[in-house]
């Protein structure tokens, strides 16, 4: 907390400029008008203020906007955003994707901080759903973003947004999350032809039910082992040896290398030895 002291003669700030970096903390508090700061926030980032000076500027904005900053100020916070607490951010009403991008840019290259997580949460809740443009933006900054959401949160993702999802965005998703995303992806890509459809749906298949895997096995898709290993155990177990052979195509030989690993091991255990022998891989049930 900076003490209230009168501004020395001739030091009253007329604009936000580099001369302010020479002001002591108490001088910034006394000589910079909060309303001026709010209207010239875009200039703050061009000036090499110390962390302590930024604390004073934040304090002035907090006094001016005790109920939370307006979006016109939020959009130009720049590095001052790093000074905000999640409690500060919960007071905001961020509706513009440009504002979101500007603040994410400040945190770029770092792990998702509690501040960023709160900002994203506020933004998405304000929009009511995770639309394609928002998802595009968030996954560009944080490839693991989608997998950080709970299954309940993912249920608000409309199928149209699925087009924005890249395979790497799903790398850390667990089975429960893919259970939610797969039906959306199936709906989003339903009008694509066989081979194009498989390319798009492949990274979501960890949420696919048995009947969809059976259908894919009839389409010469040649699923790779990495994808097969991510399939749901309950979806894999009912597949016959012939269906798995068709599903994997030339990749079926890879089952040997994975025979001790789930879900391959679980599937092998439940097949007739005679059927396994038809693969010629030496798999033991």
């Amino acid at each position: 907390e900076v003490e209230k002291t009168a501004c020395p003669s001739g030091k009253k700030a007329r604009e936000i400029d580099e001369s302010l970096i020479f002001y002591k903390k108490w001088e910034l508090e006394a000589c910079v008008d909060a309303a001026l700061l709010a209207t010239q926030m875009d200039r703050v980032n061009a000036i090499p203020f110390t962390y302590e000076q930024l604390d004073v500027l934040k304090h002035k904005l907090d006094e001016l906007y005790p109920q939370g900053y307006p979006e016109s100020v939020i959009q130009h916070l720049g590095y001052l955003f790093l000074k905000m607490s999640p409690e500060d951010i919960r007071k905001w009403n961020v509706t513009s994707l440009e504002t979101l991008k500007a603040l994410l840019e400040v945190n770029k290259g770092h792990e998702m901080s509690p501040q960023v997580a709160t900002l994203i949460d506020r933004f998405v809740k304000g929009r009511g759903q995770l639309d394609k443009d928002t998802l595009d933006t968030l996954t560009a900054f944080y490839p693991g973003y989608l997998c950080s959401l709970s299954p309940e949160e993912l249920s608000s993702v409309p199928p149209s947004s699925i087009w924005a999802v890249r395979p790497q965005d799903l790398d850390t998703c667990d089975p429960r999350q893919l259970d939610v995303l797969y039906p959306k992806a199936r709906l989003a890509f339903q009008n694509m032809n066989g081979s194009e459809y498989f390319v798009k749906i492949q990274s979501f298949l960890g949420g696919a039910p048995t009947e969809d895997l059976k259908a894919l096995s009839q389409q010469n898709v040649s699923m790779d082992l990495a994808t097969f290993m991510k399939l749901r155990t309950d979806a894999v177990l009912p597949l016959t040896v012939a269906e798995v052979q068709k599903l994997l195509g030339p990749h079926v030989e890879g089952l040997k290398a994975e025979e001790r690993h789930r879900p391959v091991r679980d599937w092998i255990l439940r097949q007739r030895q005679d059927d396994l022998d038809t693969l010629g891989l030496g798999l033991q049930g």
């Epitope: 690993h261 789930r262 255990l269 033991q284």
Partner: antibody
Amino acid sequence: QVQLQESGPGLVKPSETLSLTCTVSGGSVSSYYSTWSWIRQPPGKGLEWIGYIYYSGSTNYNPSLKSRVTISVDTSKNQFSLKLSSVTAADTAVYYCARDNVFTGFDIWGQGTMVTVSS
Amino acid sequence: DIQMTQSPSSLSASVGDRVTITCRASQSISSYLNWYQQKPGKAPKLLIYAASSLQSGVPSRFSGSGSGTDFTLTISSLQPEDFATYYCQQSYDASYTFGGGTKVEIK
């Protein structure tokens, strides 16, 4: 609901064979979704998985014990059994039988039986 | 074999504390990771399966997260009945392995 109960001698002499049986009640050992495991815990130590069996008779053993272990299943009696040969004092432990549900893990355990290896 | 390393091996906490136990696999095990609670003289009890799914009947203060090699068990607000030893276990590889255990004691 499914319950498991271990039975067998509590004292075994060194170099002899330890034999335990697990009786499954309230369910079938022939369950499609379950394998049946033996797990042990030496006094004051952690858990060690010994091996499992499927109702078809397929088995899978801990590599460190494989040469001494045999697990078998008797579907008519709804039981599965453990035999551990050439025991030493290091095999003294509480032995548990457990159901390994393919979707959830070891979701049902017996209460455990203490086996001491001593002359 | 896949080695499972738990940390810490023991911890002291008070009722109401948030407790976090970590488990690291020596190679990727996808989401095939389970957590168990064991009290003295009793058989272990399944708490969390598939890394993050809560077993039926287990209080919601228990949660699990992680995939690949790094996993976490969290107790959001420790209760008197939660003082016990906790084990992680991988079921990805056919040779199942447990972590060494974490004993949660009263501070």
